[in-house]
């Protein structure tokens, strides 16, 4: 199920490639974050907290990524027009429950401009 | 149906203690977390903080870190919310909350019958 | 702490009058939640998403609004929405409630 398009920024442009930015409430503690290409799972992060509040921070599917208090942000390098396609944040919250999925996302459109290396 | 069913009235002297209890039912008490949230006589709403009833891991407006403390038990399906060092200015209707999540936020979708505290020498 | 500013405090509306309240963050957040309290009741859940209603509320209520400025907007007044609306928002920590906008009827 798509809850709806993402209500904020969600792709930055810089140096041919692009920053994907899946947000997350800031109350969340633990969860797992799924970058979805069309159906395919690209990337993914879980966020566990253990006892003694010690965070572990796991990968499957590895991409560089950025955690924040409140995003998760995937990086795609070497820009070309295949990227060219709708990306998914699919959120799962385990805690504070309720569990909760929501997939949120938008249209990655590719312009010349944006290209890696287009000027070589 | 969904309910919470919060403890009665409480007259406390300043610098005692006073602590509010919130019984659910009608759902797994576990498969939510709950918070407190307080209400000033004519005032506004403020939030406390609140516990992750499976973890226990809880999270405290830092306005009252170190007075608020937050608990829950299991077996009764009870929350609890302790606040120390009592003042005047802690006269408040005291509320619990239940957590809840939509498309891209959080907020309390059942609330309990609220707790009158009142603070006075 | 995102301050939430909600105007006007207090306003009365006539029956079948459209009634817009407004909430204004002092930081931006990414979406507001509103709550109806009524005299000596618990809030309620009344908006969510800054768009979408809680189970119950009349379809004459809507929400709408991004970045710093929300409104909540009843399309035609009714007595039964006497009340004090508060707006709250769960993006960013500590997390807040606008001091609520009172609304009464003429």
């Known amino acids: 199920e798509i809850n709806g398009s993402a209500n904020y920024e969600m792709f930055i442009f810089h140096n041919g490639g692009v920053q994907i930015l899946c947000k997350y409430p800031d109350i969340v503690q633990q969860f797992k974050m799924q970058l979805l290409k069309g159906g395919q799972i690209l990337c993914d992060l879980t966020k566990t907290k253990g006892s003694g509040n010690t965070v572990s921070i796991k990968s499957l599917k590895f991409c560089h990524s950025q955690l924040s208090n409140n995003s998760v942000s995937f990086f795609l390098y070497n820009l070309d027009h295949s990227h060219a396609n709708y990306y998914f944040c699919n959120l799962s919250i385990f805690d504070p429950p309720p569990f909760k999925v929501t997939l949120t996302g938008g249209y990655l459109h590719i312009y010349e401009s944006q290209l890696c290396c287009q000027l070589k | 149906q969904v309910q919470l069913v919060q403890s009665g009235a409480e007259v406390k002297k300043p610098g005692s203690s006073v602590k509010v209890s919130c019984k659910a039912s009608?759902?797994?008490?576990?498969?939510?977390?709950m918070h407190w949230v307080r209400q000033a006589p004519g005032q506004g709403l403020e939030w406390m903080g609140l516990i992750s009833i499976y973890s226990d891991h809880t999270n405290y407006n830092q306005k009252f870190q170190g007075r608020v403390t937050i608990t829950a038990d299991k077996s009764t399906s009870t929350a609890y919310m302790e606040l120390s060092s009592l003042r005047s200015e802690d006269t408040a209707v005291y509320y619990c909350?239940?957590?809840?999540?939509?498309?891209?936020?959080?907020?309390?979708?059942?609330w309990g019958q609220g707790t009158t505290v009142t603070v006075s020498s | 702490e995102n301050v939430l500013t909600q105007s006007p405090a207090i306003m009365s509306a006539s029956p079948g009058e459209k009634v817009t309240m407004t909430c204004s963050a002092s930081s931006s957040v990414s979406y507001m939640h509103w709550y109806q309290q009524k005299s000596i009741t618990s809030p309620k859940l009344w908006i969510y998403?800054?768009?979408k209603l809680a189970s119950g509320v009349p379809g004459r209520f809507s929400g709408s609004g991004s970045g710093n400025s929300y409104s909540l907007t009843i399309s035609s007044m009714e007595a039964e929405d006497v009340a004090t609306y508060y707006c709250f928002q769960g993006s960013g920590y500590p997390y807040t409630f606008g001091g609520g906008t009172k609304l009464e009827i003429k």
């Open positions: 909350g239940r957590n809840n999540y939509g498309n891209y936020g959080w907020y309390f979708d059942v």
């Open positions: 009608g759902y797994t008490f576990t498969d939510y977390a």
């Open positions: 998403d800054t768009s």
